[in-house]
Amino acid sequence: QAAKEVLLLDSKAQQTELEWISSPPSGWEEISGLDENYTPIRTYQVCQVMEPNQNNWLRTNWISKGNAQRIFVELKFTLRDCNSLPGVLGTCKETFNLYYYETDYDTGRNIRENLYVKIDTIAADESFTQGDLGERKMKLNTEVREIGPLSKKGFYLAFQDVGACIALVSVKVYYKKCWSIVENLAVFPDTVTGSEFSSLVEVRGTCVSSAEEEAENSPRMHCSAEGEWLVPIGKCICKAGYQQKGDTCEPCGRRFYKSSSQDLQCSRCPTHSFSDREGSSRCECEDGYYRAPSDPPYVACTRPPSAPQNLIFNINQTTVSLEWSPPADNGGRNDVTYRILCKRCSWEQGECVPCGSNIGYMPQQTGLEDNYVTVMDLLAHANYTFEVEAVNGVSDLSRSQRLFAAVSITTGQAAPSQVSGVMKERVLQRSVQLSWQEPEHPNGVITEYEIKYYEKDQRERTYSTLKTKSTSASINNLKPGTVYVFQIRAVTAAGYGNYSPRLDVATLEEASGKMFEATAVSSEQNPV
């Protein structure tokens, strides 16, 4: 039996009597015979060659067709040459007829010949003579006929003898199906062939265990009328953690992984990573090593860098310049940046607190790509510790102790801080009297204050200055009816402080002696 055939009847496979219906009973006879290999089998023989007009029918038992539509009938038979039978030339024939009758159930033992549909007249390609009998040359003829499409649940086959000397050695009834196969990691189930010789049945495959359909490429095959699968379309691919082995998806072994179904094969775990179970889609990082969220699974696990090297500093009053060399170990990454941590420390116990937000960093405090920074606006005569930490993409994932280079310094004299609380005390046509408060941080002895003023319309293109040692002053020789801008800064031995915010004051008009309040307008600080 070829793999693509599903047997509905095989007379050779039956050890007991077939007990088919013979009509008349003196016609076809069931006897034990031999097949082509001289194996005993049940055969039906008829050799009614003496009388003319033979009409001997042999009918099989009812054959359920299952879900078949096209049925094949294979007959193996031997036919004796009429010339080997003396004296019967007028009555002996060398053909027989094959019929079928469709029905939904077993109709009993009566053969109603008129209901049967003729399939074909069967003739032998080879008949054998008396001489062949002696040599045991039982010449076996094989004929295959097709019936269908069938519409009922089953059918009978019938053989009509019209006067031949014949032995039915084998009757095989089958239909063809495409047997379940695995192709492109898809299982295609047993599929019965179509009802027509040229028909193709499209079948959708189901992915094998641990496989999935390739995107927008569902696996399909066509089952041909001959029971053969035709060229596959689409495919399944092994899921993450699995790779193809023959017709199956096998899990990646330990120390291997496959992160995507698109990858063909499992890969060895990248450096500093491992998988201690089968079927891994990614490898876990070793202790102390990490994978950044943006790192693809195929890159090595990395660790935070070591501390920057050769940290040096330069102090200029309340400004510190820091410079360093890259870390000896970048942790296996090339995204190293630096961040600066500033701590202000007390003189006594050496306790330190973060510097706060009023400190300036140039170019920036974190995310430094270059290996230098300038820290500004420090307090004068204060102790500071600066920690320079090298950072990479996995530093924030690490729970281990930070690695940094540190330096402790003491700042020198600093310029005073900004003057505050500038007020106009009196405004006249040609003079304005101002007062202010001492800076919050004088950073030494204030030697004088410098007042800068200019007509607002001039936008500082030309300005005048006036110096005073006190915290008030009268500015004279102004134009009546004009808006002036005033800014004040403190001066110490260490230098100039920053100017106070701008204060706009309008002098009185000449015609009127009336005083009025000018509105103070503060603006951004002007640099020295």
């Epitope: 031999l34 023989q45 050799c47 003496m50 004796r80 008396q130 009998l133 039982m138």
Partner: antibody, heavy 121, light 106 residues
């Protein structure tokens, strides 16, 4: 039940004739050929020939003389063996036997009980 | 004319034993012989025809084989009712019998 019924023993003088009947029953007489076999006392079997019961066409064994004639009466399903000019050496049991043709070979599957013909002066 | 020679003429066996009867043709025959059994006072009985087909009602201890000129009838285990004379017969254009083998009780 298929049967071949033959007549009882016959005693004949040399030169006489005898006609041995063989009546068939239990099957269609004309569907099978009929063969004749004789067995001399204490001897083996000797095939004499056969007749096509449908056409009446006889086939005689090689070396057979014209003294043996096979005939039929299909109306009574009977075959006959007639021996003329009997000789002492014709003394034997005469059997009719139905011929069985098959695809794979032939044989005589049903035998009459035999008719003993004795030729004696 | 083809002559069939059977041997031995007499075969003595005990019940239950195997009996092997030979039939040799004077020339290669065109068919395998049929085999017959004949008991005293009875008509012959067809045992085997068509090379190896047992006739209706014949037990399967009887089997036949051979080709060309040498043929054999085997009784695998002789039963008491098997003691008889056995004839081979070839069927061609002219049918002939062997002279017979007598199987007797040892």
């Amino acid at each position: 039940q298929v049967q071949l019924l033959q007549s009882g023993a016959e005693v004949k003088k040399p030169g006489a004739s005898v006609k041995v009947p063989c009546k068939a029953s239990g099957y269609t007489f004309t569907s099978r050929a009929m063969s004749w076999v004789r067995q001399a006392p204490g001897q083996g079997l000797e095939w004499m020939g056969w007749i096509n019961t449908n056409t009446g066409n006889p086939t005689y064994a090689q070396g057979s003389t014209g003294r043996f004639v096979f005939s039929l009466d299909t109306s009574v399903s009977t075959a006959y063996l007639q021996i003329s000019s009997l000789k002492a050496e014709d003394t034997a049991v005469y059997y009719c036997a139905r011929v069985r043709f098959t695809v794979y070979g032939d044989g005589m599957d049903v035998w009459g009980q035999g008719t003993l013909v004795t030729v004696s002066s | 004319e083809i002559v069939l020679t059977q041997s031995p003429a007499t075969l003595s066996v005990s019940p239950g034993e195997r009996a092997t009867l030979s039939c040799r043709a004077s020339q290669s025959v065109s068919s395998n012989p049929a085999w017959y059994q004949q008991k005293p006072g009875q008509a012959p009985r067809l045992l085997i025809y068509g090379a190896s087909t047992r006739a209706t009602g014949i037990p399967d201890r009887f089997s036949a084989s051979g080709s060309g000129t040498d043929f054999t009838l085997t009784i695998s285990r002789v039963e008491p009712e098997d003691f008889a004379v056995y004839y081979c017969q070839q069927y061609g254009p002219s049918w002939t019998f062997g002279q017979g083998t007598k199987v007797e009780i040892k």
